[in-house]
Structures are given as C-alpha cells and as structure tokens.
C-alpha cells in the first residue's frame, strides 16, 4: 500500500461559500470517502470554515497507511466581500465596456493571493479592472469573471453588456 | 520584499512643470489602487492624487485639479504623476501609496522625493 | 470637504505613562455602507508614515496591542497604553469615507517629558 501522505499528494479543493452562515466548505477532490482525523469531514467535505483562516486536515483512508497526509486548507475571503461592478461612463457607453471588482470589505487575508481574470469573447485579462474601447455600438457582450485564492476559484461572475446606440452621424 | 521607490523630485521655478514616478516591486501592482500624498514643510499631510488600479477612474481635490495629473504603467509596475503650472505651495515631500481599494488603507509608502517650487 | 481637527498639537509624556490623541471630523464620517473608514497613521522622525488602525478600531498585522483607536460619527481616540521609547514620532487620523475627497488631521507630535 502506498503512504496516504503519497496516495494524496496531489489532492486539489474547491471552497462553496454559504451566504447565511459566512462560513465555507472545502470540497475535497478524491474517489473514495476519506477520514480527516480531528476535522470531520463527511462526503469528503469540510464545512464551517472560517474566511482567511487556516485548517489543517490530516486526511487517510484505508488503501493507503501512515503517514497521512496533512493538508493545509488556505479559506477564501468572503464573497460577499467583492461585488463585480460596472464603470462604465454613460457618455462612452456606446463603444466602452468597463468593469472592476470592488472590495467593499477590508478583509485579513493576504491581497497577494487573489488573482482577478475576466474573459470577455476570446479575450483574457488577468486584472482587477478592464477597460473595453472601439466597440460595436447595440452590440451585446458577455464578460465571465472569476476571482481564485492561492489559485483556487472561490467566486464568479457574468455580465451582459448592451452598448448604446451610436451617436447619429457616427 | 513590497517596495515602492519614487523619483523624479527636483527645484522648479514657479509655474513649471515636473514629472514624479513610482517603481513598485513584490507584488501584483495591477490589483492596487494608487495615490500619491504629500507632506508640506510644515508637516502636514495632503492627499494629492488617486488611480484605480486599472487606471479607469482617477481623482483630485480642488487644489490641484487641472494642474496635476496621475497615471499607471501596470507593464511596467510604475505610477506617474505630471504636475504642471505649479506653485509655491506645491513645495512638499512627495510619497506614493498603495490601497486595495477605496474602502481599505494605505498600507504600504514609499520613502518620498522632494519637490522644491522657488524663484 | 471634511475637515480633520487632531488635540493636542504636541503631547509630552513619560516613558510608560498612558497617551491619548483626539481626532475630530467636522461631520461624520459614518459611510452609507454603515463602515467608519477612519484610520491611524505614525510617523517616525526621517520615515514615511506607517499604517497602524483602520476602520477606527482595528489593528494593523504587527501594530502591538498597546494601541487601540475607539470613537463613532465624528469623535475619535487613539490611545497608547504604556508608551515605549519606539512610539515617538507624529501621529495622523485620516478619514477615507467621503470617497475620493480624502483627508489627513494635522498631525499630534508624541514626544519625551
């Protein structure tokens, strides 16, 4: 049998955020219900866990023998604390899309780690903020927008933008 | 490390120009807000200029609105701000600032650069 | 704009002896969002300002627990506990809830009896 430090190595998580309770929940990615030592964990889950706080989940299960493999879940920020936001100027609006994440909440974990990426179209943008000129105007535009954590998607968002009409004579 | 280093700061006569630059290292500048703040001779501290981090949306108070302008290079890690038609008043130590955003706190300052407005 | 008046001027204290700044603004600084984005600034003698309480009453990572900020609407206090040698220098509030129109107090000097 492998070490369930070895069989694990490379295990990835995806956190869901509960709106009512504040709270996270890490979903580990593995094939077989695993145990989590002192964390329970059912459905290879880890619920309650607090915004910008560090657990540690020492995870086994019975294919594999000690050492297990201990894995440090790094939590998101809350998403509540981000809101997607649309900049753009009403006199520009027939031919600029902008939008930019706000951060309407200070928050303790380490700004470092967040990545912004918007893909509007075939277009990618690692940024906070994006600025789109030389539009079509009347064109409808889709932006999708994910923020990640230590390279973990933890929020997303989509916007459908309408440009104005052109200016007559343009 | 997380460094900001201005520099461009000289003595101009009155009714000059001048440009001021800020070099950040160690970290992803594109995410930051940006302002620069001065702090005349007398000690006080002035908010001079905000950039958000994209560079869409700039801002000023009223004593150096149309005279000075900010701007960012995110290619380059480097925030600028153009001052023209200056005065005496605009006599300060210059200091670049980073803030996540609007609601948070400047967190991180560099060391300055003096800016000498004199006949 | 708002205005930010910071008592006193300069503050002569003993080494371990409590100290407190008084910052007020002249109308509040309450945000709509019900945030109070007021902040403390230190300043020691030939270095830049260093951040140490934002939103009034939280502390910045590494900023001791000695200093704490308290107040609401447009009064605000920072306080030093015990004050320690490395404490000395001027200290700023600042208010950043009039979104852009940001303002700084005039500055309190913390300096030795």
């Known amino acids: 049998k492998p070490t369930c430090d070895e069989k694990y190595a490379n295990i990835t998580v995806d956190y869901l955020y509960n709106k009512e309770t504040k709270l996270f929940t890490a979903k580990l990615n593995v094939n077989e219900n695993v145990q989590c030592g002192n964390n329970t964990c059912t459905n290879n889950e880890v619920h309650n866990l607090t915004e910008c706080k560090n657990a540690s989940v020492s995870i086994s299960h019975n294919s594999c023998t000690a050492p297990d493999k201990t894995l440090i879940l790094d939590v998101p920020p809350g998403v509540e604390k981000f809101q997607l936001h649309d900049c753009t100027q009403v006199e520009k609006a027939d031919t600029t899309i902008c939008l930019k994440w706000k951060n309407i909440e200070t928050f303790t974990c380490d700004t470092q780690n967040i990545t912004y990426r918007f893909q509007c179209g075939n277009m990618i943008f690692d940024n906070k903020e994006i600025k789109l000129e030389n539009l079509e105007p009347e064109h409808e535009y889709k932006c999708d927008s994910e923020i990640l954590y230590n390279n973990h998607k933890f929020t997303n968002a989509s916007k459908i933008i309408k440009t104005d009409f052109g200016s007559p004579g343009e | 490390e997380v460094q900001l280093v201005e520099s461009g700061g000289d003595l101009v006569k009155p009714g000059g120009s001048l440009k001021l630059s800020c070099a950040a290292s160690g970290f992803a500048f594109s995410n930051y807000d940006m302002s620069w703040v001065r702090q005349t001779p007398e000690k006080r501290l002035e908010w001079v200029a905000y950039?958000?981090?994209?560079?869409?949306?700039?801002y000023y108070p009223d004593t150096v609105k149309g005279r000075f302008t900010i701007s960012r290079d995110n290619a380059k890690n480097t925030l600028y701000l153009q001052m023209s038609s200056l005065k005496s008043e605009d006599t300060a130590m210059y200091y670049c600032?980073?803030?996540?955003?609007?609601?948070?706190?400047?967190?991180?300052w560099g060391a300055g650069t003096t800016v000498t407005v004199s006949s | 704009d708002v205005l930010m008046t910071q008592t006193p001027l300069s503050l002569p204290v003993s080494l371990g002896d409590q100290a407190s700044i008084s910052c007020r603004s002249s109308?509040?600084?309450?945000?709509?969002?019900?945030?109070?984005?007021l902040e403390w600034y230190l300043q020691k003698p030939g270095q830049s300002p260093k951040l140490l309480i934002y939103?009034?009453?939280n502390r910045f990572s590494g900023v001791p627990d000695r200093f704490s900020g308290s107040g609401s609407g447009t009064d605000f206090t920072l306080k030093i506990s015990r004050v320690e040698a490395e404490d000395l220098g001027v200290y700023y509030c600042?208010?950043?809830?009039?979104?852009?129109?940001?303002?700084f107090g005039g500055g309190t000097k913390l300096e030795i009896k």
């Open positions: 600042f208010q950043g809830s009039h979104v852009p129109m940001y303002t």
């Open positions: 109308q509040s600084i309450v945000h709509s969002n019900g945030n109070t984005y």
């Open positions: 939103k009034v009453s």
């Open positions: 600032a980073r803030r996540y955003d609007v609601w948070w706190y400047f967190d991180v």
């Open positions: 950039i958000s981090s994209g560079g869409v949306s700039t």
